[in-house]
Interface confidence: low
């Protein structure tokens, strides 16, 4: 079947990185600069993605694969294939239409991206607040007040949570 197809369609013999040139008797021509074809049998090459402005090049375009972009420092990717870059904020902030704003009281954000989320409501699980929340950190819930016998001290607070993406020292 493959042999038959190639007899019928000479373009099927053109490998990735080339295109089937109708202007030259359907011979396989290499993709021009700044274009690529990632599969064989293509009649045109696709224009390479250009990583400009807030985008920067993560992987250069080649004759067989498109360029890949990420975001310049201070920005992070959104969407599949980094179709958008969104401004980073500090921990304890979120991005609004008017720029980075501190999290409101009762909310936190422990990352440079995303939105401020409400502190955990310990009482919903019948627990008490062991460590108060901040703009950057959620509250730490401890045992329920009933679990602490009179005069007993609270349990030792756990070590602070690691920042996302960081391994322990």
């Amino acid at each position: 079947f493959e042999r038959t197809r190639s007899l019928q369609d000479p373009c099927s013999n053109c490998p990735a990185g080339t295109f089937c040139d109708n202007n030259r008797n359907q011979i396989c021509s290499p993709c021009p600069p700044n274009s690529f074809s990632s599969a064989g049998g293509q009649r045109t090459c696709d224009i390479c993605r250009q990583c400009k402005g807030v985008f920067r090049t993560r992987k250069e375009c080649s004759s067989t694969s498109n360029a890949e972009c990420d975001c310049t420092p201070g920005f992070h990717c959104l969407g599949a294939g980094c179709s958008m870059c969104e401004q980073d904020c500090k921990q304890g902030q979120e991005l609004t239409k008017k720029g980075c704003k501190d999290c409101c009281f009762g909310t936190f954000n422990d990352q440079k991206r995303g939105i401020c989320r409400p502190w955990t409501n310990c009482s919903l699980d019948g627990k008490s607040v062991l460590v108060n929340g901040t703009k950057e950190r959620d509250v730490v819930c401890g045992p329920s007040p009933a679990d602490l016998s009179p005069g007993a001290s609270s349990v030792t607070p756990p070590a602070p949570a690691r920042e996302p993406g960081h391994s322990p020292q």
Epitope: Q50, G53, L78, G79, A80, M84, E86, Q87, K97
Partner: antibody
Framework: QVQLVQSGAEVKKPGASVKASCKAS????????IHWVRQAPGQGLEWMGR????????EYAQKFQGRVTMTRDTSTSTVYMELSSLRSEDTAVYYC????????????WGQGTSVTVSS | DIQMTQSPSSVSASVGDRVTITCKAS??????LSWYQQKPGKAPKLLIY???RKVDGVPSRFSGSGSGTDFTLTISSLQPEDFATYYC?????????FGGGTKLEIK
Amino acid sequence: QVQLVQSGAEVKKPGASVKASCKASGFNIQDTYIHWVRQAPGQGLEWMGRIDPANGNSEYAQKFQGRVTMTRDTSTSTVYMELSSLRSEDTAVYYCTTGNLHYALMDYWGQGTSVTVSS
Amino acid sequence: DIQMTQSPSSVSASVGDRVTITCKASQPINTYLSWYQQKPGKAPKLLIYRVNRKVDGVPSRFSGSGSGTDFTLTISSLQPEDFATYYCLQYLDFPYTFGGGTKLEIK
């Protein structure tokens, strides 16, 4: 204030092309994206694509790939959307809309360009 | 493509009623969802972005909520000027996709 003013209504025959314009004022178009959204009579909203006027890069919905071309003229703060091989289903109001660069928001809209495709 | 399924497609309500419109994404869209209001013959108007953030000037009776794939627009007490068609939009990924719309009519 921010304004997007679009070109007037068009009547086209099937197979023809239409080129709608969108002139921006009150902001620098190179600081934003310009999106095009269409709405057929009595139907919902459909995103067609967007252009980054700073560099001319555009992304199109697959449905319109090969038929739509978005361009810009930064000297006149105008963006254009050309749709070719028109068919009756392309009868719609075509809106240009803009949003903050980092949000992909569409918070300012033109008044719309009505395109009627009829033989 | 990410599909946005909006319900109901139409709803009849009276002034003062509480109305809820839902939008379901075919895959998680984080918080990249906005809501638009459109009146006949007019361009859509952005009400809410990033799920729950109101645009300046939008009345407090409008609120948005949800996360992941399920989102809600609530109008706490309908006013005469709220009768319109409402659309959700996901803008996590290309192509951006709108819900089919909810027409809010006077009962």
